[in-house]
């Protein structure tokens, strides 16, 4: 049994780090492998993660952690029974992928404006809470040529779009993702998308 692509891990800077790797051949990850992890810290214990399959030769493991601080460093050992396949380390603060924003809602009852709101995925006491900026993707299923990214660089998780910039009488979808500038993170996954119908019509005198 051999590791083809070494484990690569990202942290949500809250309670979970996700490690993914590829094996040399088809593997039943949960039955054959264990990823052991231990915080380099006085009297810390070794914890075990049972991986799941992620495609034929891919494995993924979700490491449960306490809150993350910048000093944290983990040792990682990938075992197949009594055989050590790989040994490495992981510093969560240097490999952060934020959680995806949630509760994306579209408010169309605001005059002349489409208002999108969503929730910050972190509690106020988390370091990332005040560091997230967002990208909102809006596209139309009726008009495949239409797709826009709106960068939200302020803290408030809202975006206002003049309804007049969207075509009337067709449906749109929106989704949002986040990143944290000062932590040099990757982008989060996209939130689930939300659909709405743009019924806005310009006043008669403006037509």
């Amino acid at each position: 049994m051999k590791v083809l692509q070494e484990p690569a891990c990202v942290s949500d800077y809250m309670s979970i780090s996700t490690c993914e790797w590829k094996m040399g051949g088809p593997t039943n990850c949960s039955a054959e492998l264990r990823l052991l992890y231990q915080l380099v810290f006085q009297s810390s214990e070794t914890h075990t993660c049972v991986p799941e399959n992620n495609g034929g030769v891919g494995c993924v493991c979700h490491l449960l952690m306490d809150d993350v601080v910048s000093m944290d460093n983990y040792t990682l050992d990938l075992w197949a029974g009594q055989q050590l396949l790989w040994k490495g380390s992981f510093k969560p603060s240097e490999h952060v992928k934020p959680r995806a924003p949630g509760n994306l809602t579209v408010h169309t009852n605001v005059s002349d404006t489409v208002l999108l709101t969503w929730s910050n995925p972190y509690p106020p006491d988390n370091y990332l809470y005040n560091d997230l900026t967002y990208a909102v993707n809006i596209w139309s299923e009726n008009d495949p040529a239409y797709s826009r990214i709106h960068n939200v660089t302020y803290l408030k998780p809202t975006l206002r779009i003049p309804a007049s910039t969207l075509k009337s009488g067709i449906s749109y979808r929106a989704r949002v993702r986040a990143w944290a500038q000062h932590y040099n993170t990757t982008w989060s996954e996209w939130s689930p998308s939300t659909k709405w119908y743009n019924s806005y019509r310009e006043p008669f005198e403006q037509r």
Epitope: L39, Q42, S44, E45, M65, D66, S70
Partner: antibody, heavy 125, light 112 residues
């Protein structure tokens, strides 16, 4: 009531051996790391050794490394310190203390919040 | 190893007056925001040490509120707002960031 009771101290000749015990009660023993601290006559406190809750991880002061062995039996709620190749400078009161909660990924630290009454070790010919 | 240096080593105090003991570490004991791995212990004559303050500023259970801990990084202070006769003994700071744990030399607090 949370309590630690040491035993096993006594008079021993240089080069000899002693085994100290520390019985814990009133708390979930296996969840806590444990520590030994000693105090030579008229001197300050000196850390000797620590062990994680499971017993998998042990730590020693340079002055005792290779001579002392810390261990625990969680089924008996008991901590041990096996002392071999004793020297005159090992003469001290030995205290066991409850250390950090080590069941969480990052052990939770509340200080050495419970101490035993101490057991006296005298090494002399 | 981290060296812990206490001062003063002897502290005569009048009952009812405040007292302050300083402890300096040879390297930072700050692990994360608000968490400095330094403790303060009191050892009364003929007794085992007892925990007063942990993580720099957290008062242990049952410890009177006249005891307080402060400081961050490498400089720490134990303050007693009004010394009482029962407070006499040796006070030790200890770093618990990692092994080897190291103690200060001890400060002897006595009543004038």
């Amino acid at each position: 009531e949370v309590q630690l009771v040491e035993s096993g101290g006594g008079l021993e000749q240089p080069g000899g051996s002693l085994r100290l015990s520390c019985a814990g009660s009133g708390f979930t023993f296996r969840d806590s790391a444990m520590t030994w601290v000693r105090q030579a006559p008229g001197k300050g406190l000196e850390w000797v050794s620590s062990i994680s809750g499971s017993g998998d991880n042990t730590y020693y002061a340079d002055s005792v490394k290779g001579r002392f062995t810390i261990s625990r039996d969680n089924s008996k709620n008991t901590l041990y310190l096996q002392m071999n190749s004793l020297r005159a400078e090992d003469t001290a009161v030995y205290y066991c203390a409850k250390d950090r909660l080590s069941i969480t990924v990052r052990p939770r630290y509340y200080g050495l919040d419970v101490w035993g009454q101490g057991t006296t070790v005298t090494v002399s010919s | 190893d981290i060296v812990m240096t206490q001062s003063p080593l002897s502290l005569p105090v009048t009952p009812g007056e405040p007292a302050s003991i300083s402890c300096r570490s040879s390297q930072s004991l700050l692990y994360s925001i608000g968490k400095n791995y330094v403790d303060w212990y009191l050892q009364k004559s003929g007794q085992s040490p007892q925990l007063l303050i942990y993580l720099g500023n957290k008062r242990a259970s049952g410890v009177p509120d006249r005891f307080s801990g402060s400081g961050s990084g490498t400089d720490f202070t134990l303050k007693i707002s009004r010394v009482e006769a029962e407070d006499v003994g040796f006070y030790y700071c200890m770093q618990a960031l990692g092994s080897p744990y190291t103690f200060g030399q001890g400060t002897k607090l006595e009543i004038k």
